[in-house]
């Protein structure tokens, strides 16, 4: 992890790097590896793409052992094929307006992401997509055997979406907080980000935090009862400890993780909270990290993969985050 | 964000006819009814009414010579009459979105007295 | 008239388990009477937890649970937390309107 020790690199050759990575020395000048990108996990030993003007950043002058790879001030983002100056707002899609900050792009979503229980009135309520609307809009099926006449047999008229109002006003800043992005890995520690000006100055900043959606080693779907075909948040029985880059977390933590479907729908979280977490390195020194847990999560046919990257992104995605 | 928000005179005469608005954001009345639900102090809730999403409108029997719920599709605004009220009529009134009745205002308190 | 009654107060210690129900006057309670749970802590505002007897709410915690048990629709919380301290409502559906319940005061021990 770090450089005192000697010089020690893979028996094979040089690492083969995936497309638009580059291939570079280590940070103790020992070894070829792939070059980390933006918004993954760096340390003195994985150092980021310089030929991307990516950095390190380890947060505060006390931890110098994991970092985030950040693009340097004023950094232009490459999305969809467009290069966007930092600052620059635009619309990804008619779903998503997006802000490109030092090289980090922050959307939030302009579609309603409410939900609908049923009712006597909207007995089985759903969200459907229809021709030549952005949103999806809410439907109400009406029961097929029902013959009584009242509120559940009504003719559906369909949802004039509100998007929620991600904005406040404060002291002359128009404070705008975007969504905390879908965790980078699927299983294991990944990183999370957003851009806010909340802040004293009202300047753009991009905040990151640490995530697991759920434990790689985890063998959930043994889990799914008989007749279910999904398990949404799993019981984890032990309290756990949180790992980094070979650095173990304090206290031990009984957290809640997102479970698996066996019908093609993935479970993300959708309820979150931020909350500091400190760890210990063998070496003795200890780093804060921000981190998140999981409240509530939610099973869905939005997966990450499909057409839309900020629709898998964002569905359904931590809503209501605490901080 | 969806949000209710109950509105109307806090002190009405026995005898008149109490008007409260429930101002909505964030969702609309042509997609979600909306009811209105009161609760006695130190007591449960009792339910109104409800006016649903194409308009139509049911109402517990106990109100139903009295009461009328209407909305303003425009404004995204529900509106409870309750006439000829008494002091058994002193609540606080809430209004409540149809679906689970999950989402809720904070409650306006009506006094009635002379 | 139909009443619906509730347990009037129930206690549980953390980590516990707890089942609260609500009874229909007039028969079993079913699907078609859509049973709705909402939630009220002290000195906030009522939220709905469960609509349509087992459909969670996007901010209900996965060990709340709705369902239909021995002809009433039933509540069941696992593993309580101190914050799920508060006072529960049931309403009940009957083709033209809804009843509420007498309330359920939760107390979690300690």
């Known amino acids: 992890q770090n450089c005192s020790g000697p010089c020690r690199c893979p028996a094979e050759q040089a690492p083969r790097c995936p497309a638009g990575v580059s291939l570079v020395l280590d940070g103790c000048g020992c070894c070829r590896v792939c070059a980390k990108q933006l918004g993954e996990l760096c340390t003195e030993r994985d150092p980021c793409d310089p030929h991307k003007g990516l950095f390190c950043d380890f947060g505060s002058p006390a931890n110098r052992k994991i970092g985030v790879c950040t693009a340097k001030d004023g950094a232009p983002c490459i999305f969809g094929g467009t290069v966007y100056r930092s600052g620059e707002s635009f619309q990804s899609s008619c779903k998503y307006q997006c802000t490109c900050l030092d090289g980090a792009v922050g959307c939030m979503p302009l579609c309603s992401m409410d939900v609908r229980l049923p009712s006597p009135d909207c007995p089985f309520p759903r969200r459907v997509k229809l021709p030549g609307k952005c949103c999806e809009e809410w439907v109400c099926d009406e029961p097929k055997d029902q013959t009584v006449v009242g509120p559940a047999l009504a003719a559906y008229r369909l949802e004039d979406t509100f998007g929620p109002d991600p904005t406040m006003i404060r002291a002359n800043c128009l404070v705008q907080t975007t969504e905390w992005s879908a965790c980078s890995k699927t299983c294991g520690m990944g990183i999370s980000t957003r851009v806010t000006n909340d802040n004293a100055s009202c300047r753009l900043e991009k905040q990151s935090r640490l995530c697991m959606v759920r434990p790689c080693e985890a063998d959930l779907e043994e889990n799914i009862k008989k007749g279910k075909k999904c398990i949404r948040t799993p019981k984890i029985s032990k309290p756990i400890k949180f790992e980094l880059s070979g650095c173990t977390s304090v206290k031990t933590y009984r957290a809640k993780f997102c479970g698996v479907c066996t019908d093609g729908r993935c479970c993300t979280p959708h309820r979150t909270t931020t909350l500091p977490v400190e760890f210990k390195c063998p070496d003795g020194e200890v780093m804060k990290k921000n981190m998140m847990f999981i409240k509530t999560c939610a099973c869905h046919y939005n997966c990450p993969g499909d057409n839309d990257i900020f629709e898998s992104l964002y569905y359904r995605k931590m809503y209501g985050d605490m901080a | 964000e969806v949000q209710l928000q109950e509105s109307g005179p806090g002190l009405v005469k026995p005898s008149q006819t109490l008007s409260l608005t429930c101002t909505v954001s964030g969702f609309s009345i042509s997609t979600f009814g909306v009811h209105w639900i009161r609760q006695h102090p130190g007591k449960g809730l009792e339910w109104i009414g409800v006016?649903?999403?194409?308009?139509?409108?049911d109402y517990n029997a106990a109100f139903m010579s009295r009461v009328t719920i209407s909305k303003d599709t425009s404004k995204n605004q529900v509106s409870l009459k309750l006439s000829s009220v008494t002091a058994a009529d002193t609540a606080v009134y809430y209004c409540?979105?149809?679906?689970?009745?999950?989402?809720w205002g904070q409650g306006t308190t009506v006094t009635v007295s002379s | 008239e139909t009443v619906v009654t509730q347990e009037p107060s129930l206690t549980v210690s953390p980590g516990g388990t707890v089942t609260l129900t609500c009874r229909s006057s007039i028969g079993a309670v079913t699907t078609s009477n859509y049973a709705n749970w909402v939630q009220q802590k002290p000195g906030q505002a009522f939220r709905g937890l469960i609509g349509?007897?087992?459909n969670r709410a996007p901010w209900t915690p996965a060990r709340f649970s709705g369902s239909l048990l021995g002809g009433k629709a039933a509540l069941t919380l696992s593993g309580v937390q101190p914050e799920d301290e508060a006072e529960y409502y049931c309403a009940l559906w009957y083709s033209t309107h809804y009843v509420f319940g007498g309330g359920t005061k939760l107390t979690v021990l300690g």
């Open positions: 409540a979105r149809d679906g689970g009745f999950d989402y």
């Open positions: 349509g007897t087992s």
């Open positions: 006016i649903w999403r194409r308009g139509g409108t």
